[in-house]
């Protein structure tokens, strides 16, 4: 049941074209730009999605460039390669030779270089900062009410396990939500915290990524909880190499 | 891998009364644990719920207030309610999730009987 | 998210077959699991995501279903089969009233 047999349509990613040639003739649905295979009961990879709204037709694409400032992923949209699992290829490149080394989450993590540049393994961002400013309320919201919401909100809208949701912090109208996933603890079928972090991002831009579900409705106690900025920190197993020119 | 409740009693109306669930054989930190409670005769009823990690606690909309779900050791989740009446008097269960992101419970308890009457 | 189960209860010989169903309220996306419980014994978990079967579970117990509408389909129906089948939405914990179904009864004639 990897998609809705009804309407044959992917519940998780609207980025998909689904039809009934499955085996058995079950809907089946695979990633624009890509062609992959999708698995529709859970979070298609970042990599396939990044490569979908980079096929995307200009005038057609419903979804709009990060502001410069929004993101620490500075580089902000490029074609990725994807490999067969649709992770990202450890090294990547542009159309004109340059390349560059990315983490698990596709975020640049050298110098760029040409082609003779190595990156010997993909490595794993291991702990995701997302950091929200909310719009302005009557009151603060109740620490430990918000903690709870966004705990669930993770776990039934993009099915990552508590267990990964490290911490929830909250002075307002900051809230950091700290997401962890070293390498042993990610079992089979549990949803990358990378993957987890940039549906989320999505949702909050209300770009979401999901078919035929509303957009994200973030209550707590009642009262809307809505973001008007995000950054998102990332930190992997191996540290960075950059030099030191890119640090002053 | 094993749950059971303890505690459960005969107790008169608007007693309080604490049910605690004990594991073994597992990591709780790795589940969700959940209360359900069954009237006598009567279909299952969910209470509430609690994150292990993170300790997060959910109730069903009529438990709200009157019922708290706590992790009080490595191996134990407590039940305590309040205010209670006839209406109470249920077989209580404490179940685990089976460590999906779904709330399928795959281990239960044998269940405690609790009995308010005057 | 309410639960609908119905029948409450069904009679069927033995090597028949039941069919019960169950009715969400919402949407759950086939987080749906249905359990069996015998008399004086806790629930136990016969299917999960409205038709993967649990563990050691006999293949005559067939789910399925998506969106709103669920069945649980019991073929050759057995004597062990006799007891009460719920239905229960896996899909958010989030301002519920209760995530089963009313239940229903198999007797087995």
């Known amino acids: 049941h990897t998609a809705a047999q009804d309407n044959c349509t992917c519940p998780t990613n609207k980025m998909t074209v689904c039809s009934p040639d499955g085996p058995g003739g079950r809907c089946q649905c695979r990633a624009l730009g890509s062609g992959v295979a999708v698995d529709c009961s859970t979070l298609t990879s970042k990599c396939l999605l990044l490569k979908a709204r980079m096929s995307a037709p200009k005038n057609a694409r419903t979804l709009v460039r990060p502001n410069e400032h929004a993101l620490v992923d500075n580089d902000g949209l490029y074609d990725p390669d994807c490999d067969p699992e649709g992770r990202f290829k450890a090294r990547q490149c542009n159309q004109t030779s340059v390349c560059w080394c990315v983490n698990s989450v596709g975020v640049r993590r050298t110098d760029k270089g040409d082609l003779s540049l190595r990156c010997d393994e993909l490595v794993r961002t291991h702990h995701i900062l997302i950091d929200l400013r909310h719009r302005p309320t009557a009151s603060a919201f109740n620490h430990s009410d918000l903690d709870a919401e966004l705990r669930r909100l993770f776990r039934e809208r993009y099915r990552l396990h508590p267990k990964f949701v490290a911490a929830v912090h909250y002075e307002q109208p900051t809230i950091q939500i700290e997401l962890r996933q070293n390498t042993s603890q990610k079992a089979a079928g549990d949803v990358d915290i990378g993957d987890a972090a940039y549906y989320f991002e999505r949702d909050v831009k209300g770009e979401s990524l999901f078919q035929g579900r509303g957009g994200l409705d973030l209550r707590v106690r009642g009262e809307p909880l809505q973001v008007e900025r995000t950054l998102i920190y990332y930190l992997d197993e191996i540290p960075p190499k950059f030099s030191m020119k890119r640090l002053t | 891998q094993s749950l059971e409740e303890s505690g459960g009693d005969l107790v008169q109306p608007g007693a309080s009364l604490t049910l605690t669930c004990k594991a073994a054989g597992f990591d709780l930190n790795n589940y969700s644990m959940l209360w359900v409670r069954q009237a006598p005769g009567k279909g299952l009823e969910w209470i509430g719920c609690i994150y292990i990690s993170g300790g997060t606690t959910y109730y069903a909309s009529w438990a709200k207030g009157r019922f708290t779900i706590s992790k009080t050791s490595s191996t134990t989740v407590t039940l305590q309610m309040t205010s209670l009446t006839a209406a109470d008097t249920a077989t209580y269960f404490c179940?685990?999730?089976?460590?999906?992101?779904?709330?399928?419970?795959?281990?239960w308890g044998p269940g405690t009987l609790v009995t308010v009457s005057s | 998210y309410d639960m609908t189960q119905t029948p409450a209860s069904v009679s069927e010989p033995v090597g028949g077959t039941v069919t019960i169903k169950c009715q969400a309220s919402e949407d759950i996306y086939r987080l749906l699991a249905w359990y069996q419980q015998k008399p004086g014994q806790p629930p136990k978990l016969l299917i999960y995501?409205?038709?993967d079967l649990a563990s050691g579970v006999p293949s005559r117990f067939k789910g399925s279903g998506s969106g709103t509408e669920y069945t649980l389909t019991i073929s050759g129906l057995q004597c062990a089969d006799a007891a009460t089948y719920y239905c229960q939405q896996g899909y958010t914990i989030g301002n519920i009233d209760n995530s089963f179904g009313g239940g229903t009864e198999v007797v087995v004639k």
């Open positions: 995501d409205a038709s």
């Open positions: 179940a685990r999730d089976d460590g999906s992101t779904s709330y399928y419970l795959n281990l």
